[in-house]
Interface confidence: low
Amino acid sequence: SDKLYQRKEPVISSVHTKVKGIAEVTENVTEGGVTKLGHSIFDTADYTFPLQGNSFFVMTNYVKSEGQVQTLCPEYPRRGAQCSSDRRCKKGWMDPQSKGIQTGRCVPYDKTRKTCEVSAWCPTEEEKEAPRPALLRSAENFTVLIKNNIHFPGHNYTTRNILPTMNGSCTFHKTWDPQCSIFRLGDIFQEAGENFTEVAVQGGIMGIEIYWDCNLDSWSHHCRPRYSFRRLDDKNMDESFVPGYNFRYAKYYKENNVEKRTLIKAFGIRFDILVFGTGGKF
Amino acid sequence: SDKLYQRKEPVISSVHTKVKGIAEVTENVTEGGVTKLGHSIFDTADYTFPLQGNSFFVMTNYVKSEGQVQTLCPEYPRRGAQCSSDRRCKKGWMDPQSKGIQTGRCVPYDKTRKTCEVSAWCPTEEEKEAPRPALLRSAENFTVLIKNNIHFPGHNYTTRNILPTMNGSCTFHKTWDPQCSIFRLGDIFQEAGENFTEVAVQGGIMGIEIYWDCNLDSWSHHCRPRYSFRRLDDKNMDESFVPGYNFRYAKYYKENNVEKRTLIKAFGIRFDILVFGTGGKF
Amino acid sequence: SDKLYQRKEPVISSVHTKVKGIAEVTENVTEGGVTKLGHSIFDTADYTFPLQGNSFFVMTNYVKSEGQVQTLCPEYPRRGAQCSSDRRCKKGWMDPQSKGIQTGRCVPYDKTRKTCEVSAWCPTEEEKEAPRPALLRSAENFTVLIKNNIHFPGHNYTTRNILPTMNGSCTFHKTWDPQCSIFRLGDIFQEAGENFTEVAVQGGIMGIEIYWDCNLDSWSHHCRPRYSFRRLDDKNMDESFVPGYNFRYAKYYKENNVEKRTLIKAFGIRFDILVFGTGGKF
């Protein structure tokens, strides 16, 4: 609450996060033309990335384009991309939607469709929907430990959200354990009024707000965090503005002295930890 | 404008960026002692990295050191590094400029020059100039979509820079479309009075400032962002303070059971999105 | 100092860091059942990661699990994990401490111990102590160059911590060179009253605070940074809250068409650069 006689100072904050959990992923795997069910285990090294600062990312879904090599090939026949003759293809043209640079030739993509040939990582990425349900939907049960160290330099005061009295096997709950800093990802979504299973398909951004309203006067000292959660990406966003949260990354390798890559389009939840508040002192 | 009767509150912000574009790179490639022109395509997975938060990086140039292996070799003969006898080389010495630890022996680097032998990733990185013009100079035509969600917790007010009425095929222009949040990289530089082609060689840091000056009173409500651009690195910086923007990263692999790496010195533009402003309410 | 007649404005900041240094690492390497001493060199591409923003990470220690493959195997026999019959093992169970999903069978881990079989990356990670002393303890002698550009938009004032008059071969010292922005990592720890050699084993978080107290009035203009250092992680933290600073990442590769990975548990120092302060003008 506002105490007008106090000197207020904004918080200086440092955050450290640690995600825990294992996901079992079942997906169709094609090898040598044969498709079969593949089971694999994803642990933290597989679904999260060594990221600094006030964000962490948990991959909840993905689309893989394996064995790509730099060469010429027909581009993917998305809406409006088909051609019937070379006239439709412009040498040197880069369509922002395409994944390569046109050679000027119209070539067969499959038995029924022709598209412009491109210089690209081939075969080009298929523009298929993200798998539904999400492959790592069980990430809902992962937990994240959030450590937050704060400082009011003008008041020469430092504290942290984890106190020595706390129990490392707790789970945050708004009513029963509002000071526990281990959060189940599904609970974060529930608190924010969002459906994890749904968001996991396309990805999204979730804000974890840590509010420190600190009274540093010795006679009424109080300085503990309050956690709240809200979704930061726009779930009603128009397709042209790239809804959800995804990025592409590649694993490069050599096969028979040819550089190849596996392209992964990773969908997931980026969690932004937004720390704010003030310290007031007479 | 300052309304002294209002309660002002700083903005809490979350940013999400999405870069689009393809670059065609032409460079000399040496294989089996034969040098020929190589053409390759770089897409987002090749030139940018899955990075969190208020920054994104676009690689505009690079120098590769391929097939490095941990062993002993002569260090690179940069200025002042040549030797004529073992006396000039100090066992265990690590020159901050060097890439390894000296063994104490002076060995031939090539037919005309000798340098101190080092234990290092060999052959050591050649200290050659960044290619000019920059290999990915066409990154000037890449675009970035910036999504910014802001919150004034004290006023319980949230908004974002992208409105439902916006057109996903727009491009930001200071006069004609100042609310469009899709920016052409070259335009950002032009607005900041900088030359993209020049900066792309050594790299640099560009600030995209998003200023929210929000009047949250219902009778004169206004809350839209204003974008401005300024270069953040010092273009007149002394050589000793590492001008431009670059970092090294490695791709590791095994060949005949020997661990090897390709070292990439990546030059590029780091874009920092700096969100600031206040929300005022009676 | 507070000048009540001034209009104060918080600082907008951008940071760029550059770490320099080489570490020689000596460790036991086992190949074909034979253990011998291995020496390797780590340079910036090996011990740091291309990270944006106000943080950088220096790896000081690690534990490797090489040649892991997705299959079934006994889990690591940590405290409380041993079994004598299948009844102790629950099909589908994921122990948060474990690295896989139980199959329901109790199988031999070695000649004397049995543990529950899991579907996981196998062999599962051994839960051994971080090496002591730390493998990259010589990181104490690495240096970091910190470039900081600041802006007070309301006052239309920009400056940076590195001035043209500065000498690129300086090293920060609180008394002799308090404006030099090249810091020896060991000195940062000494200033903060911490022991680098000790922290390097488990990792930790170190804050580098840059305080700008700027008087922008022309008649008494002053705007230079003041550097201070403090440890941000809790060194007295209970085991359950994951003391120190570490994360796991993987290097994936194929061998005889089988996907494998090397898992690295990287311990190290995350340096957070915390920039704060105000610009005041009449």
Partner: nanobody, 127 residues
Framework: KVQLVESGGGLVQAGGSLRLSCAAS????????MGWFRQAPGKLREFVAS????????RYIDSVEGRFTISRDNTKNTLYLQMNNLRAEDTAVYYC????????????????????YGQGTQVTVSS
């Protein structure tokens, strides 16, 4: 709204077998864990068996482990419970439910983690 319809109950002698089915309509339940619960006269509803969304993992109450087998056919949106070697104490109304969470691995046996829509099917085991 999901509708769950149980079938396959009946009167059987001790040591006999029954196969219960639960057909889901209204939406696909293949994304959810599913479970069987039972309620004997004058007793609370109790967990019997549960299966995760993929059908790979199953859980049972100790008293039915080895005698009952839960399975599902996601293509048919159907859940099954094969009950062998039935005992008198298995007499109850059996309900099919789908798991809403949180955390199937920890909470598969907690009735409050499920949504119940079925009317139930009576199983009576005579001795």
């Amino acid at each position: 709204k999901v509708q769950l319809v149980e079938s396959g109950g009946g009167l059987v002698q001790a040591g006999g077998s029954l196969r219960l089915s639960c057909a889901a309509s209204g939406r696909t339940v293949s994304d959810y864990g599913m479970g069987w619960f039972r309620q004997a006269p004058g007793k609370l509803r109790e967990f019997v068996a549960s299966i995760n969304w993929s059908g790979i993992y199953t859980r049972y109450i100790d008293s039915v482990e080895g005698r009952f087998t839960i399975s599902r056919d996601n293509t048919k949106n159907t859940l099954y419970l094969q009950m062998n070697n039935l005992r008198a104490e298995d007499t109850a109304v059996y309900y099919c439910a789908y798991f809403l969470g949180p955390n199937w691995y920890s909470n598969y046996g907690r009735p409050s983690s499920y949504d119940f829509y079925g009317q139930g099917t009576q199983v009576t085991v005579s001795s």
